[in-house]
Interface confidence: medium
């Protein structure tokens, strides 16, 4: 038997609670609340949760929250892309799915969401503080990140909200020209938060899912908890690792384009280049736009495998291999 | 077929840094994955790293990975190659390769190479 | 690290004869996932860069004559030249990317007799 515990998320207050013109009033600041969320900032969510009955056996679940199409998902652990990550598997809309040891099991649950069942022993199993990270690439946002990581304390059986591991980049004019056309909206609904600011908060409790629901909603958590705002990140550094991530390349098997450290030289010099804030409190979620290239055309190194799948008249290549989706 | 136009030879002193560019003259920049290959006069081949520009993935050679950064520069369609702390032994002829769509093992293009010479 | 080690060092060769160059590796590099298996075979002329003529064992890349084959197995492979012209005389390499790092042979020099 598997315990599961829902990500908190952020709740509307119920009308019994406080009366259904108090809850009419609030219909206008939550829906700019999402608004002010989703459409100009894309959202990655991350849940990782521990089987409960194999102690080294964890789910990792990850989704997007964007509109752009995803042409590109990886999951990573040890710590973010570029941070000392390294690829448990890649999944691609159209060329296929490839996975590493310990990941046992990579599969899309729906169009913008994906999970993962790792399981392994020794040295490439996984433990309770482990950082497990997934990156989107899509289109036309770019590439978004966050990680997630369950606590030590952590029972099994139990599901961690997402520990957030962002990678802020520069040159997010696009984007965030994009976000400024909400600037106005977002700014009322601090006013309409603040005027409403004597009634009582929106409770924090877990997301509800009728046993009918898709499996990936179930673990998506509601947009209105995507209210944590983003924030530069500081390196993760995890205290448990596969003994293999000591070296360039985490051969539990075949991979590809495994994560190095950054050299902090190349770490781009832009508003939100790397500043070192305290990671937010539980039950945050974040997401960063890191596909874009500095100003100055460098990238940090990031983790993520490569792919081809693309037809090529030189020979019937294969859809998948060991380095990467073919 | 596309060539991989790479920048010309250089001389440095150990110690020094040095910087290799490959730019492809035709083809699509972002989705594939360029690789950089070494080799020592009258040797063999030795891989370097790679870097995916689509997907900002880049691996190293474990023996480099503290002296070696790959980066790719997507208003120029460039990939540079900038190795520090240079020694003797790194003097050889650098080779940018590019791999089909995405791939990551596959170096069908090469560069035409550039001899870097570490010497006192 | 996969380790690939090309025998003979040096292949004297005569125009119009077969001509064949070893590579062994110290792991397969056959991937059961898809069935492939993942070495690669270049050639470095004097004076050029590599090339690519094999990929995945048996693969011709493309412009490369079909008098070069590629084959073998797990850990044991072979590169097969049907019949030798004067202009792939070179250094010929094997290369796997199984995984990482991203190994050589040593190099196999094809030489006119």
């Known amino acids: 038997m598997r315990t599961e515990a829902q990500v908190p998320a952020l709740q509307p207050p119920e009308p019994g609670l406080e009366g259904a013109m108090g809850h009419r009033t609030l219909v206008l600041p939550w829906v700019l609340l999402t608004l002010c969320v989703t459409a100009g900032t894309p959202e990655v969510w991350v849940q990782v949760r521990m089987e409960a009955t194999e102690l080294s056996s964890f789910t990792i679940r990850c989704g997007f929250l964007g509109s752009g199409s995803i042409s590109l998902v990886t999951v990573s652990w040890g710590g973010p892309n570029g941070a000392g990550g390294t690829t448990l598997a890649v999944l691609h809309p159209e060329r296929g799915i490839r996975q590493w040891a310990p990941a046992r099991q990579a599969r899309w649950e729906t169009q913008s969401s994906i999970s993962l069942i790792l399981e392994g022993s020794g040295a490439s199993s996984p433990c309770a503080n482990t950082t497990f990270c997934c990156k989107f690439a899509s289109f036309p946002e770019g590439s978004w990140e966050a990680c997630g990581s369950l606590p030590p304390s952590s029972d099994p059986g139990l599901s961690a909200p997402p520990t957030p591991a962002p990678i802020l980049r520069a040159d997010l004019a696009g984007i965030l020209g994009v976000s400024g056309v909400l600037l106005f909206g977002c700014v009322y609904l601090l006013h309409l938060l603040r005027r409403h600011k004597h009634r009582p908060a929106p409770r924090l409790q877990p997301s509800r899912t009728s046993p009918q629901a898709p499996r990936a909603r179930a673990w998506a958590p509601s947009q209105a908890s995507q209210a944590a705002l983003h924030v530069p990140y500081a390196t993760i550094n995890t205290s448990c690792r596969p003994a293999t991530l000591d070296t360039a390349h985490p051969h539990g098997g075949p991979s590809w384009w495994a994560s190095l450290p950054t050299h902090a030289a190349h770490r781009p010099q832009g508003p939100a280049a790397w500043a070192s804030t305290p990671i937010p409190a539980r039950g945050s979620f974040v997401s960063v736009e890191n596909g874009l290239y500095a100003q100055a055309g460098e990238r940090p190194p990031h983790t993520g495998p490569g792919l081809t799948l693309f037809p090529d008249p030189r020979g019937p290549r294969a859809m998948e291999g060991p380095l990467g989706v073919r | 077929q596309v060539q991989l136009v790479q920048s010309g030879a250089e001389v440095r002193r150990p110690g020094s840094s040095v910087r290799v560019s490959c730019k492809p003259s035709g083809g699509t920049f972002g989705t594939y994955a360029f690789t950089w290959v070494r080799q020592a006069p009258g040797q063999g081949l030795e891989w370097m790293g790679g870097i995916t520009p689509i997907s900002a993935t880049i691996n190293r050679a474990q023996n480099l990975q503290d002296r070696l950064t790959i980066t790719a520069d997507e208003s120029t369609t460039t990939v540079h190659m900038d190795l520090t702390s240079l020694r003797s032994e790194d003097t050889a002829v650098y080779y940018c390769?590019?791999?089909?769509?995405?791939?990551?093992?596959?170096?069908?293009?090469w560069g035409q190479g550039t001899l870097v010479t570490v010497s006192s | 690290d996969i380790v690939m080690t090309q025998t003979p060092l040096s292949l004297p060769v005569i125009p119009g004869e077969p001509a064949s160059i070893s590579c062994r590796s110290s792991q397969s590099l056959f991937y059961s996932d898809d069935g492939n298996t993942y070495l690669d075979w270049y050639l470095q002329k004097p004076g050029q860069s590599p090339q690519l003529l094999i990929y995945?064992?048996?693969h011709r890349a493309s412009g490369v004559p079909d008098r070069f084959s590629g084959s073998g197995s797990g850990t044991d492979f072979t590169l097969k030249i049907s019949r030798v012209e004067a202009e792939d005389v070179g250094v010929y390499y094997c290369m796997q990317h199984m995984e990482f790092p991203l190994t050589f042979g040593g190099g196999t020099k094809v030489e006119i007799k």
């Open positions: 995945r064992l048996s």
């Open positions: 390769a590019r791999g089909f769509e995405y791939s990551d093992g596959l170096l069908d293009d």
